[in-house]
């Protein structure tokens, strides 16, 4: 009779993550009488996958019923596979012995492959924001994918970007793998409403690309510019002098009024307005009553935007000649900024 | 080498359940398959469960099934032991061991490294 053979007949076989891995084995012959073993790996280091005598394999099934006298498909299932379960698997056909049962021939080997999603692609800002004109690095990190080939592009508003650098870890083999992209981006006065995306393509997705996205506005900061101006007399003695702030980002920001150095009013940013841009525009002002100075006047608007040093507007307020009343100033008025007298 | 250390025993009342732990350094825990033995006082070191390196094969001395489950987390390089339905008979130190090879309940004769036990005592 012809010596017993373990035949693989598969030498490769491609399973998704999360799916149930068939591999496949028989025997050509019932003599040696002793029983199957499966293994991952060859050697001495090898692990072992399924005994036939005994354990607990909860992952493990037989296809056919290894208890029939005349069995000989030795085939198991392996479910949930994980990107860990890769490797090749050797079905092996024991010979009782005594005390220990003896090795007596092994299949070909069957290479089990596991391709793995990744995961969905994270994309982390700077800590601190920055104004415009500076370029601010975004990371991308995605984990957990398999085989290893990969593709990263990055986008801002839909238009590729070219300045990043991407690493896969590790360089060698492995169940697993991970993908690391920075990416520098200048920034712009019109970025508030722009988005960084971080796109990842591979095998698994089938064509449907994963994104990571990060809004700008949580990394960029737009400064205030300032205009002060002398508005019209409203009443005898009295001048409105206003202070514009105009297209700051975020929104957080003080404004102090100085007159002649002396601190006269602190304000915080309240009722703002927003530009089509996602700026903000705020304006503040302060009535001078000009009889209770002798001299010419310095009105400084000194603004504290988003924890910056201050940045100031100063105007220079005449008294020597005092203005006519030239009636009320209704778009002053309306502006909801607290008013209040300086004596 | 490979230095093993066992945490999670105690005393517990009969019936109770508890789970040991087993940390592992000095090598590649995934490379390595563990097990889990006891020694009652006067009595012979004894297989309790085993598990290989990935986790996919378990093995379960015949008193021990059913009431006790031997895992691993190859990213903590930790393998533990849960004990439900303890007796009194459960009484023992219980020893981590790593094997470089597995072959079952041959993991005893297997076995290259050993910790310094933790103690458990079930009371009646």
């Known amino acids: 009779e012809e010596e017993l053979q373990v035949i693989q007949p598969d030498k490769s076989v491609l399973v998704a993550a999360g799916e149930t891995a068939t591999l496949r084995c028989t025997a050509t012959s019932l003599i040696p009488v002793g029983p199957i073993q499966w293994f991952r790996g060859a050697g001495p280091g090898r692990e072992l996958i399924y005994n036939q005598k005994e354990g607990h394999f909860p992952r493990v099934t037989t296809v056919s019923d290894l208890t029939k006298r005349n069995n000989m498909d030795f085939s198991i299932r392996i479910g949930n596979i994980t990107p860990a379960d890769a490797g090749t698997y050797y079905c092996v056909k024991f010979r009782k012995g005594s005390p220990d049962d003896v090795e007596f021939k092994s299949g070909a080997g069957t290479e089990l492959s596991v391709r793995a999603k990744p995961s969905a692609p994270v994309v982390s800002g700077p800590a601190a924001r920055a104004t415009p004109q500076h370029t601010v690095s975004f990371t991308c990190e995605s984990h957990g994918f398999s085989p290893r080939d990969i593709t990263l592009k990055w986008f801002k508003n839909g238009n590729e970007l070219s300045d990043f650098q991407t690493n896969v870890d590790p360089v060698g083999e492995s169940v697993s793998y991970s993908i690391h992209s920075t990416a520098k981006v200048v920034l712009t006065r019109e970025d508030v409403h722009s988005q960084v995306i971080c796109e990842v393509a591979h095998v698994t997705l089938q064509g449907d690309p994963l994104r990571g996205t990060a809004n700008l506005s949580e990394t960029i900061r737009v400064p205030p510019t300032l205009e002060v101006t002398q508005q019209p007399v409203r009443a005898e003695n009295q001048v409105n002098v206003t202070c514009q702030v105009r297209k700051f980002y975020p929104q957080r920001l003080q404004l102090t009024w100085l007159e002649n150095g002396n601190v006269s009013r602190t304000e915080t940013a309240s009722t703002v307005t927003e530009n089509k841009d996602g700026t903000y525009n705020w304006m503040s002002w302060l009535l001078v009553n000009v009889s209770a100075h002798r001299d010419d006047v310095k009105l400084t608007c000194q603004v504290e935007h988003d924890g910056q040093p201050a940045v100031s507007k100063s105007h220079d307020l005449k008294v020597s000649a005092h203005p006519k009343e030239q009636g009320s100033n209704t778009a002053a008025e309306n502006t909801g900024s607290n008013e209040r007298n300086i004596y | 080498q490979v230095q093993l250390q066992e945490s999670g025993g105690g005393v517990v009342q009969a019936g109770d359940s508890l789970r040991l732990s087993c940390v592992a350094s000095?090598?590649?825990?995934?490379?390595?398959?563990m097990g889990w033995f006891r020694q009652a006082p006067g009595k012979e070191r004894e297989f309790v469960a085993g598990?290989?390196?990935?986790?996919?094969?378990?093995y379960y001395a015949d008193s021990m099934k059913g009431r006790f489950t031997i895992s691993r987390d190859n990213a903590k390089n930790l393998v533990y032991l849960q004990m439900n339905s303890l007796r009194p008979e459960d009484t023992a130190v219980y020893y981590c061991?790593?094997?470089?090879?597995?072959?079952?309940?041959?993991?005893?004769?297997?076995?290259?490294?050993w910790g310094q036990g933790t103690q458990v005592t079930v009371s009646s």
């Open positions: 061991a790593a094997a470089l090879t597995f072959r079952g309940s041959d993991l005893p004769r297997d076995s290259n490294y």
């Open positions: 000095g090598r590649t825990f995934s490379s390595l398959d």
């Open positions: 598990i290989s390196r990935s986790g996919i094969s378990q």
